[in-house]
């Protein structure tokens, strides 16, 4: 199932997603979708790139991250409640039906109304994992969401509940990381 | 107005190779937000997607492995069409073969447009 | 592969009823399930994608509904011109794959 990420009406939403290339300046195409992940590609398409550079995108959802390194981490801009959803981060790797695929839920909570202005939660210190169930067709995922001031007893905890589910075949120590070669 | 016409013969023979052409018309085989399929149907197994060819910076392919050893769909941007061959047919491979197109809303992996379709015998 | 099994397999009914056609998808496929009529000799149509959005020019007696595994195509006032076989198809899961049909026919 997805995870939820959050963010208030006005802020900037941040939807985690990343991938190792397999040499730097090897890339893979992406895209990002609002939707669940389809059987190809992704519906309603936001943004895509290609094995060079970002090749298509809409206003307010851009990568901030450095996608040559393998963040395609969403950002959309000036959330409202209308982006609530699910959004697809599809990792299109080459050969037939490799592509990684993970649904990430965003929920817009309106904007609290307080008398000084809060600082945004920066999301990109907080510690998204996933895991992915590797195996013949589309992997399954499932994203932990956000684990801030996770330690490292935490983490061995963590993997220790999880050893024995399908889901738990790659716990990763950078995030929602697929390895590519 | 988008339309798919295909061509190509109507009986082939066992262990033979099966051609079939799909022209455009009113878009690109090239595009970048189209995908190009054939899928093919049959009393005995219904419907079957088989594979599809795309464009999107580079050109890429998507096969059932039903198929995948067999088939090879190849876009010809100069005639702006695509085809399908699967090799080694046998009887079992009679059916009416259809081209389609995916990708009108923005949505992948059902179809907007049908070509008319080729019924295709495989007998000696 | 996930398995589509629509029902029932044919059904007569008089013009100006409602027709509902079921499709089971064997797991969950969220939502991403067409709907196609295909008359008899002709291509297939689509009627219906996203379990629920109709598709331009479809003729709005024809809706779509459900989510998780069961799914629905209902023809309200049946007209002489829906006289086809219905399939539905989805596209969540890697192969696509198609229900059997439903022949509908004029009683």
């Known amino acids: 199932s997805e995870v939820e990420y959050r963010a208030e009406v006005g802020q900037n939403a941040y939807l985690p997603c990343f991938y190792t290339p397999a040499a730097p300046g090897n890339l893979v195409p992406v895209c990002w979708g609002k939707g669940a992940c389809p059987v190809f590609e992704c519906g309603n398409v936001v943004l895509r790139t290609d094995e060079r550079d970002v090749n298509y995108w809409t206003s307010r959802y851009w990568l901030n991250g450095d996608f040559r390194k393998g963040d395609v981490s969403l950002t959309i801009e000036n959330v409202t409640l209308a982006d609530s959803g699910i959004y697809c981060c599809r990792i299109q790797i080459p050969g037939i039906m490799n592509d990684e695929k993970f649904n990430l839920k965003l929920v817009i909570k309106p904007a609290k109304v307080t008398p000084a202005p809060t600082r945004q939660r920066d999301f990109t210190a907080a510690f998204p994992r996933m895991l992915t169930t590797r195996g013949h067709g589309p992997a399954e995922t499932q994203t932990l969401g956000s684990l801030p001031d996770i330690n490292l007893t935490q983490i061995s905890t963590l993997a220790n509940e999880l050893r024995d589910s399908r889901l738990a075949n790659d716990l990763r120590d950078s995030g929602a990381t697929i390895r590519i070669g | 107005q988008m339309q798919l016409q295909q061509s190509g013969p109507g009986l082939v023979k066992p262990s033979q190779t099966l051609s079939l052409t799909c022209a455009i018309s009113?878009?690109?085989?090239?595009?970048?937000?189209?995908?190009w399929n054939w899928i093919r149907q049959s009393p005995s197994r219904g419907l079957e997607w088989l594979g599809r060819t795309y464009y999107r910076s580079k050109w890429y392919s998507a096969f059932a492995v039903s198929v995948k050893s067999r088939i090879t769909i190849n876009p010809d941007t100069s005639k702006n069409q695509f085809s399908l061959q699967l090799n080694s047919v046998t009887p079992e491979d009679t059916a009416v073969y259809y081209c389609?197109?995916?990708?009108?809303?923005?949505?992948?992996?059902?179809?907007?447009?049908w070509g008319q379709g080729t019924l295709v015998t495989v007998s000696s | 592969e996930i398995v589509l099994t629509q029902s029932p397999a044919s059904l007569s009914v008089s013009l100006g009823e409602t027709v509902t056609i079921e499709c089971r998808a064997s797991e969950d496929i969220y939502n991403g399930l067409a709907w196609y009529q295909q008359k008899p000799g002709k291509s297939p149509q689509l009627l219906i994608y996203?379990?629920?959005s109709l598709h331009t020019g479809v003729p709005s007696r024809f809706s779509g509904s459900g989510s998780g595994t069961q799914y629905s195509l209902k023809i309200n006032s049946l007209q002489s011109e829906d006289v086809a076989s219905y399939f539905c198809q989805q596209y969540y899961d890697y192969p696509p794959t198609f229900g059997q049909g439903t022949k509908v026919e004029i009683k």
């Open positions: 009113g878009d690109s085989v090239s595009s970048n937000s189209a995908a």
């Open positions: 389609a197109r995916e990708g009108s809303s923005g949505w992948y992996g059902y179809v907007h447009h």
């Open positions: 996203n379990a629920n």
